[in-house]
Amino acid sequence: DAEFRHDSGYEVHHQKLVFFAEDVGSNKGAIIGLMVGGVVIA
């Protein structure tokens, strides 16, 4: 996973994850690997 973007200097890329298994289905429209939520109850 890219942690930095090289522009005029190094800028921290604040990574967000699909952290909770229950979010996998509900976040299919999001950019998987970049966003996360809390536990989603079906």
Epitope: H14, Q15, K16, L17, F19, F20, A21, E22, D23, V24, S26, N27, A30, M35, V36, G37, G38, V39, V40, I41, A42
Partner: antibody, heavy 112, light 112 residues
Framework: EVQLVESGGGLVQPGGSLKLSCAAS????????MSWVRQTPDKRLELVAS????????YYPDSVKGRFTISRDNAKNTLYLQMSSLKSEDTAMYYC?????WGQGSTLTVSS | DVVMTQTPLSLPVSLGDQASISCRSS???????????LHWYLQKPGQSPKLLIY???NRFSGVPDRFSGSGSGTDFTLKISRVEAEDLGVYFC?????????FGGGTKLEIK
């Protein structure tokens, strides 16, 4: 930058009520579920409430069911935890969390 | 609920040593999509937990490569190849495969 900032903690007498708030920024709050996790004085972590992205579904463990209510206002990017009938065993640091990011915590002390 | 059991409770190390922490779950953490939602946090004194490793072996943003995670099914390990002073604190494993989100009891990494 992702930020979760809790507020509303304090000292409450047994049987009392308190409402915690968590202001979220740096991500699309309305798209994701959120949780409240508490850390007891012995440093153990316990999930106390979760809510899905639109607020339509919630989860509570038996230890707080019927006493705690989680809610959210997606227009204000804010998560809430309403706590009532508080007991001494609810004394803890309460964290707003999205899995990979946690707030700084809000302290609840239940004591007479 | 899935019970997460961490060992040891306390881990005294010398700076520069390798450290290893074990975490076992009461049931398999493999989700239906094949991924395993086992994570590691570090909590330093006076701070909230910070994510180190997600989904068994992936380092979170900014986490040094001296941290590595491994394991499968119900048996997982966090290794720190060369312990530095900034690594001291309490390490928690956590699972988010099953509802509710649950946590290990913590392992305190301290100077020998």
């Amino acid at each position: 930058e992702v930020q979760l900032v809790e507020s509303g903690g304090g000292l409450v007498q047994p049987g009392g009520s308190l409402k915690l708030s968590c202001a979220a920024s740096g991500f699309t709050f309305s798209s994701y579920g959120m949780s409240w996790v508490r850390q007891t004085p012995d440093k153990r972590l316990e999930l106390v409430a979760s809510i899905n992205s639109n607020g339509g579904s919630t989860y509570y463990p038996d230890s707080v069911k019927g006493r705690f209510t989680i809610s959210r206002d997606n227009a204000k990017n804010t998560l809430y935890l309403q706590m009532s009938s508080l007991k001494s065993e609810d004394t803890a640091m309460y964290y707003c969390a999205s899995g990979d990011y946690w707030g700084q915590g809000s302290t609840l002390t239940v004591s007479s | 609920d899935v019970v997460m059991t961490q060992t040891p409770l306390s881990l005294p190390v010398s700076l520069g040593d390798q450290a290893s922490i074990s975490c076992r779950s009461s049931q398999s953490l493999v989700y239906s999509n094949g991924d395993t939602y086992l994570h590691w946090y570090l909590q330093k004194p006076g701070q909230s937990p910070k994510l180190l490793i997600y989904r068994v072996s992936n380092r979170f943003s900014g986490v040094p490569d001296r941290f590595s995670g491994s394991g499968s099914g119900t048996d997982f390990t966090l290794k720190i190849s060369r312990v530095e002073a900034e690594d001291l604190g309490v390490y928690f494993c956590s699972q988010s495969t099953h509802v509710p989100w649950t946590f290990g009891g913590g392992t305190k990494l301290e100077i020998k």
